[in-house]
């Protein structure tokens, strides 16, 4: 008969730039040897070969050298595929094709996602505003996937649907920049909020602008930065937004722009003498030269590291000067937890077992929760440790000691408090005597 190949029913959701595991398993018969196994992963639609295992050997990746099997687990029936540095173009269906004597196949869907940045709000015109003036408020959010849903509302939470134009443009990586424009007639004052929703991650990014029509005070340069921290995934690029309002006749020769670390005052990047003075920060920073004349003093920080987390000050001097600090919050998603059981065979009700839940390379430190099959929290006899590697990313290991009942499911949930991302794993222990993993 046909070989039963099992894959998850739900799509695997993976963040751009992270690694994803496409799970696939089969039940090897007694006496099975890897020499009998023919394993092929391919794109479901085009049938393009992705990775294969044949004649007892891993035949390697046919997919930009970004795939890998789990060779130590193949003999136990684990034919899962690791896809590294996920890109938008990877989204779609992958077929796992297993042949021993019989053969079988199953397809697993990969859903790619990328969180949208906190929206930046711009106002046009942005000075000398009076009640009754018509203003254009632009809400921009960057580098997300898939396409966003955008909602506008006023200070009372009432949706604003008229006179809204939203455009979404994909860059070379397939990530979307969304720009939504609201045209509104000013009242005495008003708050306008823009919410950008990622439909896959169910992640909402929002910003608001409060407009009090009056003449802005003269004197110091008003430097504007986002109030909330900028959240950036490790390895991605982040934009630290900073803007000022240039006066009529302003020229870049007058501008002295300095970015520096708020605490240590270490120089990061500067613009003086009408030219970009370059990066003083490991050559990973850049300005937006074409936008400086319009008052956009934002800084692009490339290949974000954990060590970049903290406050950056944007210092603008024209005739007067002003400064403002923006916080960078670094984050990295935790991997799907792996579960191990000790002892893992000949288990009987009443035995005490140790279940270890391990999740890797996340930031910041995780929150770990255990629960049973009924969703009841398990808090007793839990020990959780978190260790940072050289890059500052945390590996979390949580150990639950429990006395077995007739059967039971034990779930571990690893939560990233910044990304509000939950990764969970569970183990079900049934029958007696029992073995883990369950044998065919």
């Amino acid at each position: 008969g046909a070989l039963e190949v099992q894959v998850p029913e739900d799509p695997v959701v993976a963040l751009v730039g992270t690694d994803a595991t496409l799970c696939c398993s089969f039940s090897p018969e007694p006496g099975f040897s890897l020499a009998q196994l023919n394993l092929i992963w391919q794109l479901t639609d085009t049938k393009q070969l992705v990775h294969s295992f044949a004649e007892g050997q891993d035949q390697g990746s046919a997919y930009a050298n970004r795939t890998a099997l789990f060779p130590d687990l193949l003999a136990q029936g684990n034919a899962s595929l690791r896809l590294q540095r996920v890109r938008v173009a990877d989204e779609g269906s992958f077929t796992c094709f297993v042949s021993i004597r019989d053969f079988g196949s199953a397809a697993v869907s990969l859903q790619v996602a990328a969180p949208y940045s906190k929206p930046s709000m711009t106002l046009e015109p942005n000075k000398d505003l009076r009640p009754g003036d018509t203003v254009t408020i632009t809400c921009s959010s960057y580098q997300g996937y898939p396409e966003a849903e955008v909602f506008w509302q006023d200070g009372q939470g009432v949706p604003l649907t008229g006179n809204v134009t939203t455009s979404q443009m994909a860059n070379e990586q397939g990530l979307f920049d969304v720009h939504s424009i609201l045209r509104v007639v000013l009242g005495a004052n008003g708050t306008y909020s823009c919410l950008v929703r990622n439909p896959v991650l169910q992640q909402d990014a929002h910003s608001s602008v409060t407009i009090t029509p009056q003449r802005s005070p003269t004197g110091a340069v008003e430097v504007q930065v986002p109030e909330d921290p900028v959240v950036a995934l490790v390895g991605t690029d982040a934009t630290l937004r900073c803007s000022f309002s240039p006066e009529p006749g302003f020229s870049l020769a007058q501008l002295n722009l300095i970015w520096q670390l708020t605490d240590t005052k270490q120089l990061v990047h500067s613009f003086t003498e009408g030219r970009d003075q370059g990066s003083a920060y490991a050559n990973r920073t850049a300005l937006f030269p074409d936008l400086l004349a319009q008052g956009n003093a934002s800084l692009r920080l490339q290949r974000v590291r954990v060590a970049d987390e903290g406050s950056f000050t944007c210092f603008v001097s024209i005739r007067d000067f002003g400064s403002a600090a923006v916080s960078l919050q670094v984050a990295a998603p935790y991997s799907k937890p792996s579960m191990t059981l000790e002892p893992n065979k000949d288990l009987r009700p009443g035995d005490t077992v140790t279940i270890t839940c391990s999740s890797y390379r996340g930031y910041p430190e995780a929150e770990v929760f255990w629960q049973d099959g009924q969703g009841v929290p398990l808090t007793g006899n839990v020990t959780t440790s978190q260790m940072a590697n050289e890059q500052g990313l945390f590996d979390v290991h949580s150990v639950l000691r429990v006395v077995l009942g007739a059967n039971g499911t034990y779930s571990c949930l690893v939560r990233n408090p910044v990304l509000q991302q939950d990764a969970h794993g569970s183990v079900t222990i049934t029958g007696q005597p029992m073995t883990f993993p369950p044998e065919a």
Partner: antibody, heavy 120, light 110 residues
């Protein structure tokens, strides 16, 4: 005319800290970078770091990271260099020098130098 | 941030020419046209003689000239005079807002 006036000689014990000041006059203080350069007895010049007086932003030579701190007081047009955890090899004349308005500019004006002696 | 290499000493008779070399890497001398040269008499602060490889500040005699080829910069003093006897240091921008000096060369007028 442009002048950089440095504080007087200092004698410190190993492990202590020293602060050297450099008062600028004759130009717009906040418009030009100030660099610190040191010279051990009978040795060559060694770049220590720089500060932008406008914002207080700093860059230090890797060798001095964690031990040197440069600050400025715009009200008195003075720059300060503090070097901590002193060792005997920090004995040197410390010069402040005015750079340009841009980075990568030469040092046209120099202070007279401050001799720091580290001795137990 | 390693130092730039200069010859320990050079000498010449009055009226002759001497050239001092300054060798770095593509990260400093070779990477930027920001090499400067300083003259230092004993017990005095350094004095700027050449900047941006070959430019002379006002007040510096035209006997002093600078050039650069690849990772090596050079200072030439033509028509050597007694007051030119001093230590000479090259300095180069090294990226990321840092500077690096040369080891120094003692010029002796015979």
């Amino acid at each position: 005319q442009v002048q950089l006036q440095q504080s007087g000689a200092e004698v410190e014990k190993p492990g202590a800290s020293v602060e050297v000041s450099c008062r600028a006059s004759g130009y717009t203080f906040t418009s030009y970078y100030i660099h610190w350069v040191r010279q051990a007895p009978g040795q060559g010049l060694e770049w220590v770091g720089m500060i932008t007086p406008l914002s207080g932003g700093t860059t230090y030579a890797q060798k001095f990271q964690g031990r040197v701190t440069m600050t400025r007081d715009t009200s008195t047009s003075t720059v300060y260099m503090n070097l901590s955890s002193l060792r005997s090899e920090d004995t040197a004349v410390y010069f402040c020098a005015r750079g340009g308005r841009a980075v990568a500019s030469s040092f046209e004006f120099w202070g007279q130098g401050t001799l720091v002696t580290v001795s137990s | 941030q390693s130092v730039l290499t200069q010859p320990r000493s050079v000498s010449g008779s009055p009226g002759q020419s001497v050239t001092i070399s300054c060798t770095g890497t593509s990260s400093d001398v070779g990477g930027y046209n920001y090499v400067s040269w300083y003259q230092q008499h004993p017990g005095k602060a350094p004095k700027l003689m050449i900047y941006d490889v070959s430019k002379r500040p006002s007040g510096v005699p035209d006997r002093f000239s600078g050039s650069k080829s690849g990772n090596t910069a050079s200072l030439t003093i033509s028509g050597l005079q007694a007051e030119d006897e001093a230590d000479y240091y090259c300095c180069s921008y090294a990226g990321s807002y840092t500077e690096v000096f040369g080891t120094g060369t003692k010029v002796t007028v015979l």
